[in-house]
């Protein structure tokens, strides 16, 4: 119950906090549990105690073990345990699970990645940040105080992020690295009454007789994944499949495109070998979702051959 895991890499600084809290004026004693040996408070030692903190400057694999802290208050002593593991540095780029701090999630609106445990150290900006061992560069990445901000977060930004900083103790510098996973979650979606982007209401589409023509019905329905959303074409108020003209078919275009984060759908109406009678039909682009239905009507007109030649 009063135990906390801490880990670090050899030759890096590691500072551990006693799991028991008290007043600043309380004395805190530290012991190496296996030997019950008191940890010195003199800063000249590589491992020393400083109140609530136990400092390894730098850490060695042999420092691994359980450390006991006793917070001495006027009425009783509070005992806590710090389970410390120091690992050898990895030669490859992979950060093993046992070195990872808690995963954080971000979204388009909130993309802060805090550098784990940094509040324990005496560090100065800037922090260095790496993703999968590559130094982060470019205007999308901003190291701010103890966290990294990523602008315009995308799903590809998910991955393992490592912060690197220098701890200063009495003029001596020690490196510290810490890694955590970052996942990208969709912003909370919402649904709107459909908005038809194309065609315009009562648009006149010029076509050439004998040639093929395409009409695109495009509508947006809100943000995020939509529970129910559809776009379709009707001919004279009849579904394409029921109209019975094999020359006129509809096919889905770009499905659920998230440009600007909006959930949009396209439906393309393909008319093969345009005929005179096609000019007499009413073409309706329909967009519908749980909020209702919106309709834009298009008519075809013969393209003027003179315009064509010019």
């Amino acid at each position: 119950k009063f135990s906390k895991q801490s880990w670090g890499l050899e030759n890096e600084a590691l500072i551990v906090r006693c799991p028991r809290q008290g007043k600043p004026s309380y004395t805190v004693d530290w012991y190496y549990s296996q030997t019950n040996k008191s940890i010195p408070t003199q800063e000249r030692n590589r491992v020393f105690a400083s109140g609530q903190l136990l400092k390894f400057l730098p850490a060695a694999v042999a420092d691994s073990g359980i450390y006991t802290c006793i917070v001495r208050s006027p009425t009783f002593n509070r005992t806590g345990y710090a389970n410390v593991t120091i690992y050898k540095k990895q030669s490859d780029c992979n950060v093993p699970d046992y070195l990872m701090y808690s995963t954080v999630s971000g979204s388009e609106k909130n993309s802060k990645i805090y550098c784990p445990t940094i509040d324990l150290y005496n560090w100065t900006a800037p922090l260095e940040w790496f993703k999968n061992c590559q130094a982060l560069q470019g205007s999308r990445y901003r190291a701010h105080k103890s966290f990294l901000v990523i602008d315009n977060v995308m799903t590809e930004d998910a991955g393992d992020y490592t912060c690197k900083f220098i701890h200063n103790e009495n003029g001596a510098n020690y490196s510290v690295t810490a890694t955590r996973s970052f996942t990208v979650k969709d912003e909370q979606g919402f649904s709107l009454f459909p908005v038809i982007g194309a065609p315009a209401q009562n648009e006149i589409k010029e076509v050439e007789i004998g040639k093929n023509a395409n009409l695109t019905c495009s509508a947006c329905f809100g943000k995020g994944t939509q529970f129910l959303a559809a776009v379709l074409w009707q001919l004279n108020g009849t579904k394409i499949t029921d109209f019975g003209e094999p020359r006129i078919q509809q096919e889905e275009g770009q499905n659920q495109s998230f440009s600007n984060g909006l959930a949009c759908l396209d439906m393309v109406l393909r008319i093969a070998d345009v005929k005179e009678e096609d000019l007499l039909l009413q073409y309706d682009c329909l967009a519908l979702n749980l909020h209702g239905l919106r309709r834009h009507t298009v008519r075809l007109s013969r393209k003027n051959p003179i315009d064509h030649h010019s």
Epitope: K1, R17, Q21, P74, G80
Partner: antibody, heavy 116, light 113 residues
């Protein structure tokens, strides 16, 4: 600068529960415990309990044991105090106060009124 | 529980004069481990949370004017305002900061004579 910002006033019926939040900023939340103190109208200050914000271990005053629950959310740097089975004498201003040698930092207070 | 008894309940003092508030605890607040007396003093004005003035019986909190001073050890403690100012009108509380449950005195209201 250190700030403790508490949730707004509440009106509750006898027998109900109330949960008050205390959002900390300007310092590392898990470095200091958080106390809860209440003050009924015209009464002395009364300590309810505190929580070790690092490991989440609460300690309660005997007068409130069984009725009070103190929790914390480290990711939100927020401490919570929930008081159940409310009675009219629980009408008071409830404060959070950061642990230290004395309580140097207090929330602005949350007035909880218990009335039928 | 440690009982904190303050006296007087109220105190009327002329501006510029000395105000003295006493606090007695039912058990010693001295911790032999570090020789600290775990007693705090607070000032509270209407509609505001208490403000820490003194901790450790005699250590002034940063930003507190030096006209406020604390003294005492063990079970008997005193808060002194050496030269009362208009802004010092408030209720003053002592607090057992030694052991759970932390307990407060009943308060002393300081008024202008």
């Amino acid at each position: 600068q250190v700030q403790l910002v508490q949730s707004g006033a509440e009106v509750k019926k006898p027998g109900a529960s109330v949960k008050v939040s205390c959002k900390a900023s300007g310092y590392t939340f898990i470095n200091y415990g958080m106390n809860w103190v209440r003050q009924a109208p015209g009464q002395r200050l009364e300590w309810m309990g505190w929580i070790n914000t690092y490991i989440g271990e609460p300690t309660y005053g005997d007068n409130f044991k069984g009725r009070v629950t103190i929790t914390r959310d480290t990711s939100a740097s927020t401490a919570y105090m929930e008081l159940s089975s409310l009675r009219s004498e629980d009408t008071a201003v409830y404060y959070c106060a950061r642990e230290g040698d004395g309580f140097a930092y207090w929330g602005q207070g949350t007035l909880v009124t218990v009335s039928s | 529980d440690i009982v904190m008894t303050q006296s007087p309940d109220s105190l009327a003092v002329s501006l510029g004069e000395r105000a003295t508030i006493n606090c007695k605890s039912s058990q010693s607040l001295l911790y032999s481990g570090n020789q600290n007396n775990y007693l705090a003093w607070y000032q509270q004005k209407p509609g505001q949370p208490p403000k820490l003035l003194i901790y450790g019986a005699s250590t002034r909190e940063s930003g507190v004017p030096d006209r406020f001073s604390g003294s005492g050890s063990g079970t008997d403690f005193t808060l002194t305002i050496s030269s009362l100012q208009a802004e010092d009108l408030a209720v003053y509380y002592c607090q057992n900061d030694h052991s759970y449950p932390y307990t407060f005195g009943g308060g002393t209201k300081v008024e202008i004579k």
